[in-house]
């Protein structure tokens, strides 16, 4: 079945943008000016998810590339990744539980909770130039706010 | 406080185009998406389409083709361009803002602009 | 395209009188529904979405129930500014965004 998607950028609430690091890894930091073009743009697809009355199940896939963050066990740790997926076959309405985000916008801040981990949380630190991360608190040092601004193409 | 006003309606004859604006304020179209929703009269709610960004827009299968919807962001305005008008396309067109993104809900609304198609 | 369908299509009830209006969607939408109220010549008001959550300045004798494919709006005890056409809204199914035909609700 075909998805609404969107293309977006993300930033979290200290305004760090988010660019990649690497062939799967992102990374946040402060970028002004024409570095702004090194920013990460977002196709965010409508999925779908569990039953709830907040919480908006989205995949956030890298436009144009065949990327998806996704949350998987490493060493015992759920671990944020990006996921290389067959284009001809993403993004689709029933994506697999490891790409999935519940979204929940507060106040115009976004969360995206991961939905295979509950309470693990897309995270960066308040330190420049480090990868963006699957943290698994709320309200501390770690940033778990973002955002959105569409992208015109 | 959010604000949508719609502007552009009129009469127009069978087989012509109109195009019809929906000016923000309170809020940013960088962040939010927009619907168009008509009613004829006396009839109920009909969706047309939604934007987001201006690369990512959805129609209802009867408004693929003749409807066409776009944004300005920085005039604050969405547009509905309709081609090849017809009778049965009179109506009131209201824009609405969805509450959030995928939400797919409206919790803003403009007051409506009435669009007559008649020769 | 799912396919949303109220009942009834006009109601006659009095002040005070509890109010149920049913909608069907043609298929599962999960809790991908919403509810609007509408006054002649004013623009729909959201009421409910997420087929249970009201939305914000929405008084309590508005409730909303259901998930999958039945849901229902629910008047505790009808005020006089609560005559008005409802409308039902599929708001998670694919791509398109769909209104139930309307619910009217008049004074007896």
């Known amino acids: 079945a075909p998805v609404r998607s969107l293309n977006c950028t993300l930033r979290d609430s200290q305004q760090k943008s988010l660019v990649m690091s690497g062939p799967y890894e992102l990374k946040a930091l402060h970028l002004q000016g024409q570095d702004m073009e090194q920013q990460v743009v977002f196709s965010m697809s409508f999925v779908q998810g569990e039953e709830s009355n907040d919480k908006i199940p989205v995949a956030l896939g890298l436009k144009e590339k065949n990327l998806y963050l996704s949350c998987v066990l490493k060493d015992d740790k759920p671990t944020l990744q990006l996921e290389s997926v067959d284009p001809k076959n993403y993004p689709k309405k029933k994506m697999e539980k490891r790409f999935v985000f519940n979204k929940i916008e507060i106040n115009n801040k976004l969360e995206f909770e991961s939905a295979q981990f509950p309470n693990w949380y897309i995270s960066t630190s308040q330190a420049e130039n480090m990868p963006v991360f699957l943290g698994g608190t709320k309200g501390g040092q770690d940033i778990t706010d973002f955002t959105m601004q569409f992208v015109s193409s | 406080e959010v604000q949508l006003v719609e502007s552009g309606g009129g009469l127009v004859q069978p087989g012509g185009s109109l195009r019809l604006s929906c000016t923000v304020s309170?809020?940013?179209?960088?962040?939010?998406?927009m619907s168009w929703v008509r009613q004829a009269p006396g009839k109920g709610l009909e969706w047309i389409g939604i934007i987001y960004d201006s690369a990512s827009t959805y129609y209802a299968s009867w408004a693929k083709g003749r409807f066409t919807i776009s944004k300005d962001t920085s005039k604050n305005t969405v547009y509905l361009q309709m081609n090849s008008l017809r009778a049965e396309d009179t109506a009131v067109y209201f824009c609405a803002r969805e509450r959030q993104i995928f939400s797919g809900d409206m919790d803003g609304w403009g007051q409506g602009t009435l669009v007559t198609v008649s020769s | 395209e799912i396919v949303m369908t109220q009942s009834p299509s006009t109601l006659s009830a009095s002040v005070g009188d509890r109010v149920i209006i049913t909608c069907q969607a043609s298929q599962s939408i999960d809790n991908w529904l919403s509810w609007y109220q509408q006054k002649p010549g004013k623009a729909p008001k959201l009421l409910i979405y997420?087929?249970?959550t009201l939305a914000s300045g929405v008084p309590s004798r508005f409730s909303g129930s259901g998930s999958g494919a039945e849901f229902t709006l629910t008047i505790s005890s009808l005020q006089p500014d609560d005559f008005a056409t409802y409308y039902c809204q599929n708001t998670g199914g694919g791509v398109s965004i769909a209104f139930g035909q309307g619910t009217k609700l008049t004074v007896l």
């Open positions: 309170g809020f940013s179209l960088s962040s939010y998406a």
């Open positions: 997420r087929a249970s």
